[in-house]
């Protein structure tokens, strides 16, 4: 495959509500007009697909209705948000970018963003 550089932050800490956001940036070698973005999770040497979306430049980035991901695109950057995360979801989240159209096809895979998720402490009972 024709390789493409993809950059993403090394570490992100999820919010107390289990939401993590990060930017996935790709160095487009050509004039990309349709892009597919896939988020992969790597844990214990197993890789699973978290979510994926294909978008046309100038159009909104739409994931499936039941997806835990949302996102927006701007130029060669995709702002990804993953929600509903719990401590057990801590892991390496890899951004995979494919330039689908026009040809030629390009593929880029980032080094991954380590997302740390800490479950909030339950609120202590208050005496009022």
């Amino acid at each position: 495959c024709k390789a493409m550089h993809v950059a993403q932050p090394a570490v992100v800490l999820a919010s107390s509500r289990g939401i993590a956001s990060f930017v996935c940036e790709y160095a487009s070698p050509g004039k990309a007009t349709e892009v597919r973005v896939t988020v992969l999770r790597q844990a214990d040497s197993q890789v699973t697909e978290v979510c994926a979306a294909t978008y046309m430049m100038g159009n909104e980035l739409t994931f499936l209705d039941d997806s835990i991901c949302t996102g927006t695109s701007s130029g060669n950057q995709v702002n990804l948000t993953i929600q509903g995360l719990r401590a057990m979801d801590t892991g390496l989240y890899i951004c995979k970018v494919e330039l689908m159209y026009p040809p030629p096809y390009y593929l880029g895979i980032g080094n991954g963003t380590q997302i740390y998720v800490i479950d909030p402490e339950p609120c202590p009972d208050s005496d009022f």
């Epitope: 495959c1 004039k31 007009t33 349709e34 294909t54 046309m56 430049m57 100038g58 159009n59 689908m100 159209y101 026009p102 040809p103 030629p104 096809y105 593929l107």
Partner: antibody, heavy 120, light 112 residues
């Protein structure tokens, strides 16, 4: 039902320009690229270029740069191609066609074609 | 540009028999992603072209399974198992491995 309806035949003089239209219906216009293809009468097909209806971004065949200009009007779900400095070599049938990502960007629906005849 | 080469005419075929149409590309259309960027279109007399096959061997919606396609990276064959009168027309192979998209000159299917 998906349809691409093209404007009618054109008889134009050498050196002039012509603008042909392709009105889309039956699907969300901004979800698919529109391609333009030239067919010299009874001959093969030549790809002219494509346009992204969202932002008007185009990809084109170098052979047609300076000859064809592709535009869209999102409000009317219509794609346009303007051909300028016409010569007899431009006499042909021109098709618009929709690209479908599920078919790996094949042209799955075509307009009925617009015949352009350049003659003095 | 990638050149797609086709014979102008097929061998005349009898209704109900099989027909083969060949196409050759000047460069392999098999990408390292495993996809072969080869397409077949049919233009019936007086009509616009219509998509038959995408990604070398996949039938587009509504295309009868009498049609099939196979090939290597550069040599491709479209087969029609039982030719019907409505199959008459010009068959074009095309590539979209790279820009510009290119078509073959077309092969006319003729009946005996």
């Amino acid at each position: 039902e998906v349809q691409l309806r093209q404007s009618g035949p054109e008889l134009v003089k050498p050196g002039t320009s012509v603008k042909i239209s392709c009105k889309a219906s039956g699907y969300k216009f901004t979800d698919h690229f529109i391609n333009w293809v030239k067919q010299n009468h009874g001959k093969s097909l030549e790809w002219i270029g494509d346009i992204n209806p969202n932002n008007g971004g185009t990809n084109s065949n170098q052979k047609f740069e300076g000859k064809a200009t592709l535009t869209v009007d999102k409000s009317s779900s219509t794609a346009y191609m303007e051909l300028r400095s016409l010569t007899s070599e431009d006499s042909a049938v021109y098709y618009c066609a929709r690209l479908r990502r599920e078919y790996f960007y094949a042209m799955d629906y075509w307009g009925q074609g617009t015949s352009v005849t350049v003659s003095s | 540009d990638i050149v797609m080469t086709q014979a102008a005419f097929s061998n005349p075929v009898t209704l109900g028999t099989s027909a083969s149409i060949s196409c050759r590309s000047s460069k392999s259309l098999l990408h390292s992603n495993g996809i072969t960027y080869l397409y077949w279109y049919l233009q019936k007399p007086g009509q616009s072209p219509q998509l038959l096959i995408y990604q070398m061997s996949n039938l587009a919606s509504g295309v009868p399974d009498r049609f099939s396609s196979s090939g290597s990276g550069t040599d491709f064959t479209l087969r029609i198992s039982r030719v019907e009168a409505e199959d008459v027309g010009v068959y074009y192979c095309a590539q979209n491995l790279e820009l510009p998209l290119t078509f073959g000159a077309g092969t006319k299917l003729e009946l005996k």
